[in-house]
């Protein structure tokens, strides 16, 4: 990584290539998806603390004051009783039990310089302090936990600040070396890993630039860079000291922890933005890494500033290569407060994988110890730190990807931090511990948070072993399986768009002259009524369906167009004819219809205006009008349509009646009655002759606890299913009544004054009416929701369930943030089989939004994985799945980017992908199994070929 330039060694700065390389990478590329794999066998798992943050007992047992004691007194006056903090000094045994709980292989802690040497010089050691560190090290060795010891984590003895001006003074270099020498002599037999200084960037930048850290000086850039310079030289001196005097017999390693943010350019194609990113990284990480891990000098672009001290050639030699590994810190302190981050007009990012790649390119692929990583939670959060789990999961998976895909030599990981404690400028307003500590308590018990449980599991599993209970399988759906595609409301053509043979006149075309048509008088030709083929939109639609090779097509009728007045007084026969044409043209190609009578849309709920203005579904008369409308559709189309859906997603429609929760429940009640009446009408009047089946489709997303270590989240997931699906499914498919869990929960909230909701009661007559009014289970499934228990007291029905969603940042998600969670489909299907009678199940909508207009890779990935899970449900779990309808055929405004075809009917690549799935009826090496029989070959039509 060195290049000759005018006989001068200059470090190459290859890190810039990170942004140059950032061409488009598919979101479903295995290198981008969450990686289920394990870390290398010898990978080290650890946890860290900083002495000042956790030790407490700041004035006890002969410890001298540090610059941070002074800073707390002078700058953080609102901080009360900080003296004891987490009190690790007193409760060493409790810390050790916490380490045992996690099962870590190393513990990174720092020695408090003023606890060992109260006035900073090594003249007189504080025996009690020495005893504490000896006890800690002995206990770790006993437990087979490797100590990684930081010599300086910001708690400089106050005496050194007052006498010398602290790190601004070069005298500190020797004083620090004396202190380090003592530590090597005293503890070196038990310590194999040493860190000289923790994140020197923050020491200099916040200590002397922003004034946000001790000693709280601000605004003097010369001081900032002088401090940085002295820190580098102090580290370098200690490294040489260790290398020469201690390494030969102690055989340890020594480094310095360097911290950084990460930055992405506004526009990757803009070279200036890329250069700004490189400068941003160089001015933070490069400031210290270039001299130590690079060419012994500051990054070139920094040296143009007059405030940057110079290294002599001898000093460069002295400083260069003074680290045995790259110790790296990536956490909130380098990102917050955001106005102090060196952004250079670009965008900060939490992409740990990318920064590791930058380090690899910039510093010749060093061995890396992540010596601080984690995030923070608000102080009011006790043990349920759910977001911390997801941050950890995300960071750790990025590290794993860096190791497995990018061949980066990360050999250990330090979760930060073991215990809640003093968080520097945030004092006690944020928490970063894996263990919760009540600072006001006497005993300072260490209570494992969810993140501690999660990290323990990661350590046990050495990463992320594959979660699937069943690997992807080869297999096929039965021959009579319905492969479909769903459209929402099909807007009818009110008049024929391409009429043919409707004009009785004969014309002569003046081809050679003015090219006009002239009518031949006295001649009348036979005409014919308009035909289905005269509708351009139907022709287009059927072409799309044929291209997909689907066997079924689901679409919804437009109630408003068929019955504009909402009753049978005015029937638009032209519209009914259009729909009949859609069905018959499809049937000619072997494409059977599944027709939805009522598919609510947001604008006016899909109701005829008179019904809408008289209260819509809050008015029981709407159910009667719906019955009349359904009867008309059965009569006009039922000879051709064998699968009917009465209402699409009534469990979502009712949410639109959200003035109060009781409106929502009332609307839902009326929708169920309406559905049941229509089902009975069909059963009584039409089934005997038409032999069809009727259902309603429910929005059926799966739910999982966002935090599996918290029982309330499991209960919230259960509640979600009850309130979302069972709310309709129990009355209609099972008991004729609302789910017991739902009734009890609403009643309990009402009793406690947390809700004014009342579920309507089914009368005995209503209960009998609705129960069993389903011929098959139709479900629309899109994603899995990760849910949290959160008490909500607002007056709307969604508040009654006390459920909130959490976005899992580690999962592949669509632009509209639908998480791609295929196994949720299988779990849902199994749940339905267990809870409702063993009936036929149709997945009537399953799909995702994808911004790509041509190669829609997310959709293809989604289709493959979700159909795979449906297959497992069918073959392994014995679910009677009869059909799968992908969602949706074309784009529309209310559901942007969900279509297989663009709004101008261009096929995306998912069309061909889905048609292949259909051809092989699932997943097989050969095409569709011979037992199914191929459709008959097209027979040649002599007259047709003559005409063409």
């Amino acid at each position: 990584d060195y290049k000759d330039d005018d006989d001068k060694l200059e470090f190459s700065g290859d890190g810039k290539a990170i942004w140059d390389k950032k061409q488009y990478v598919s979101p479903v590329n295995p290198g981008q998806l969450f990686l289920y794999d394990t870390f290398p066998k010898n990978f080290s798992w650890g946890v860290g603390t900083g002495a000042f943050q956790v030790e407490g007992s700041w004035k006890a047992d002969g410890r001298g004051p540090s610059i941070w004691d002074r800073y707390v007194d002078s700058h953080l006056r609102g901080v009360n009783s900080t003296d004891r903090s987490t009190d690790s000094y007193v409760f060493l045994e409790k810390d050790l039990l916490a380490l045992d709980f996690l099962g870590v292989s190393f513990y990174q802690f720092s020695i408090s310089w003023p606890r060992l040497f109260p006035n900073g010089t090594v003249a007189a050691v504080n025996a009690k302090g020495l005893q504490y560190y000896r006890a800690l090290l002995d206990s770790l060795v006993l437990r087979n936990i490797e100590p990684i010891v930081t010599l300086y984590h910001w708690d400089l003895p106050l005496t050194l600040q007052e006498e010398y001006g602290g790190w601004k003074n070069a005298t500190m270099i020797d004083l620090f070396n004396d202190y380090a020498t003592y530590c090597f002599q005293t503890f070196g037999d038990r310590v194999k890993y040493w860190i000289t200084i923790h994140n020197p960037y923050l020491v200099a930048w916040h200590g002397f630039g922003t004034g946000m850290h001790a000693p709280g000086e601000k605004g003097n850039l010369t001081a900032v860079y002088t401090v940085g310079h002295n820190l580098i030289k102090a580290h370098s001196k200690v490294w040489h000291n260790y290398d020469k005097n201690f390494r030969p017999h102690q055989k340890g390693w020594l480094s310095i922890t360097l911290g950084s943010h990460w930055i992405e350019p506004n526009r990757t194609e803009n070279m200036e933005d890329v250069i700004n990113c490189q400068h941003s990284m160089s001015s933070v990480l490069g400031w210290f890494a270039n001299p130590i891990h690079g060419d012994g000098d500051y990054p070139e672009f920094m040296k143009t500033s007059s405030v940057i001290p110079e290294f002599s050639e001898a000093e460069k030699e002295e400083v260069r290569g003074t680290a045995d590994f790259f110790a790296f810190s990536f956490g909130p302190n380098n990102f917050r407060p955001s106005n102090t981050v060196v952004k250079m007009g670009q965008n900060v990012s939490l992409n740990l994988r990318q920064v590791l790649n930058w380090i690899k390119l910039e510093y010749d692929n060093p061995r890396i110890l992540i010596s601080e990583n984690g995030w923070f939670t608000d102080s009011y959060i006790k043990t349920e730190d759910t977001t911390a789990i997801y941050m950890m999961k995300n960071f750790l998976n990025q590290v794993l990807q860096a190791i497995k895909f990018d061949e980066i030599q990360v050999f250990g990981y330090t979760a930060w931090t073991l215990l809640d404690g003093f968080e520097w400028q945030d004092a006690y307003t944020t928490r970063r511990g894996l263990f919760y500590v009540d600072f006001n308590s006497e005993q300072k018990e260490r209570k494992p948070k969810s993140s501690a449980h999660y990290y323990k599991q990661i350590i046990q599993d050495n990463g992320f072993p594959l979660q699937e209970s069943t690997p992807d399988m080869k297999g096929q759906f039965p021959c009579d399986f319905s492969w479909g595609v769903t459209e929402s409301v099909l807007k009818p053509e009110f008049t024929v768009s391409s009429p043919q043979f409707t004009d009785p006149h004969l014309y002569v075309w003046n081809v050679t002259g003015n090219r006009l048509l002239y009518r031949v008088e006295g001649v009348r030709l036979k005409t014919r009524p308009s035909q289905c083929t005269d509708y351009v939109s139907i022709k287009k639609r059927v072409e799309m369906l044929a291209k997909m090779k689907v066997t079924h097509y689901q679409f919804a009728l437009d109630w408003t167009s068929i019955l504009p007045t909402g009753n049978l007084s005015k029937i638009n026969r032209q519209v009914l004819r259009y729909y009949r044409c859609v069905v018959s043209e499809g049937l000619k190609l072997g494409i059977s219809p599944m027709v939805t009578l009522y598919h609510p849309t947001h604008s006016h709920l899909g109701l005829p205006m008179p019904l809408l203005s008289s209260g819509g579904w809050l008015n029981t008369n709407t159910a009667k009008a719906f019955q009349d409308y359904a009867g008309l559709c059965f009569k006009e189309l039922g000879d051709l349509v064998k699968l009917w859906i009465t209402i699409n997603e009534p469990n979502r429609l009712s949410d639109m009646y959200n003035r109060t929760s009781n409106d929502t429940y009332r609307a839902a009640h009326n929708l169920m009655i309406a559905h049941a009446q229509v089902w009975h009408l069909y059963d009584r009047q039409y089934r005997p002759v038409q032999h069809g089946a009727v259902s309603l489709s429910l929005h059926s997303d799966w739910a999982e606890p966002a935090n599996p270590y918290v029982e309330s989240h499991w209960k919230a997931a259960e509640r979600f299913l009850q309130f979302e699906i069972a709310w309709f499914a129990d009355p209609l498919f099972k008991t004729g009544d609302y789910p017991l869990a739902m009734k009890e929960y609403i009643a309990s909230k009402k009793q406690r004054g947390l809700s004014s909701s009342v579920l309507p009661r089914f009368t005995l007559k209503e209960s009998r009416l609705v129960k069993g009014t389903i011929d098959f289970y139709a479900l629309n499934h899109f994603t899995t929701r990760f849910v949290i228990h959160k008490q909500l007291n607002t007056n709307c029905s969604v508040a009654d369930r006390d459920v909130q969603f959490l976005q899992d940042i580690t999962r592949l998600s669509s632009p509209s943030r639908l998480a791609v969670t295929p196994w949720g489909m299988r779990k849902l299907l199994g749940w339905i089989r267990r809870n409702y009678r063993d009936m036929d199940i149709y997945v009537t909508a399953n799909g995702i939004d994808d911004l790509a207009l041509e190669d829609d890779q997310i959709r293809k990935y989604y289709l493959e994985k979700y159909v795979q899970e449906a297959l497992k449900a069918y073959l392994i779990d014995k679910v009677k799945i009869k059909g799968y309808y992908a969602f949706k055929l074309t784009e529309e405004k209310s559901k942007p980017r969900f279509g297989f075809f663009t709004s101008d009917f261009k096929a995306k690549s998912s069309v061909q992908f889905y048609s292949k799935l259909i051809s092989s009826s699932g997943f097989s090496s050969e095409n569709r199994s011979p037992a199914c029989g191929q459709p008959p070959e097209d027979t040649e039509c002599a007259i047709c070929s003559f005409l063409t």
Epitope: W714, E718, L740, W823, W831, I832, R834
Partner: antibody, heavy 120, light 111 residues
Framework: QVQLKQSGPGLVQPSQSLSVACTVS????????VHWVRQSPGKGLEWLGV???????DYNAAFISRLTISKDNSKSQVFFKMNSLQTTDTAIYYC??????????????WGQGTSVTVSS | DIVLTQSPTSLAVSLGQRATISCRAS??????????MTWYQQKPGQPPKLLIY???NLQSGIPARFSGSGSRTDFTLTIDPVEADDVATYYC?????????FGGGTKVEIK
């Protein structure tokens, strides 16, 4: 309180069938599934099958050909029938309530057990 | 079928001491974040009694001296401290895959 009461014969002839009824109280069969488990000195605890709240059944593949579980929700009764018993089927047969939560697959209440001896 | 192997088959513990029972599965009983492992206690002449579900969750009414832990294929039931009333046979059971299977049992006695 939740109870599962079993009734059935104590002695069954080889090659004959065993029928056990399990009457439940204080919970509804439309909400909870019911499992059947047997315990013998030789084979320990063996899960035989389950009838879920919706009425679908899952059987241990080793018994699928000779086992039928059914129920009558209105009477709060679950019926267990096993055909072609052999002496190795001698055991205590338990009906037991499923935990009833989507995310917990466990048995939380057990019947008192029906001790069945297969002997001529 | 998934085989569950319990160890030891019997265990004698002094009152007030800790008892640890191990259950090893022939394949993982964890799926998508859920650990399908349950522990039961059975006293002579009685049906089994649910102690722990989902590997680590204490059934209501069960004393806090019972705890469960583990993941994937290795699980542990701990009783700490052991009381005289804890003399019984303890069974682990998996429900990740049909058929549900039980371990062979561990008999706990007082030393």
């Amino acid at each position: 309180q939740v109870q599962l009461k079993q009734s059935g014969p104590g002695l069954v002839q080889p090659s004959q069938s065993l029928s056990v009824a399990c009457t439940v109280s204080d919970f509804s069969l439309t909400t909870y599934g019911v499992h059947w488990v047997r315990q013998s000195p030789g084979k320990g605890l063996e899960w035989l099958g389950v009838i879920w709240s919706g009425g679908s059944t899952d059987y241990n593949a080793a018994f699928i050909s000779r086992l039928t579980i059914s129920k009558d929700n209105s009477k709060s009764q679950v019926f267990f029938k096993m055909n072609s018993l052999q002496t190795t089927d001698t055991a205590i047969y338990y009906c037991a309530r499923d935990y009833g939560s989507t995310y917990v697959d466990a048995i939380d209440y057990w019947g008192q057990g029906t001790s069945v001896t297969v002997s001529s | 079928d998934i085989v569950l192997t319990q160890s030891p088959t019997s265990l004698a513990v002094s009152l007030g001491q800790r008892a640890t029972i191990s259950c090893r599965a022939s394949e993982s009983v964890e799926s998508y974040g859920n650990r399908y492992m349950t522990w039961y206690q059975q006293k002579p002449g009685q049906p089994p009694k649910l102690l722990i579900y989902r590997a680590a969750n204490l059934q209501s009414g069960i004393p806090a001296r019972f705890s469960g832990s583990g993941s994937r294929t290795d699980f542990t039931l701990t009783i700490d401290p052991v009381e005289a009333d804890d003399v019984a046979t303890y069974y682990c059971q998996q429900s990740n895959e049909d058929p549900w299977t039980f371990g062979g049992g561990t008999k706990v006695e007082i030393k």
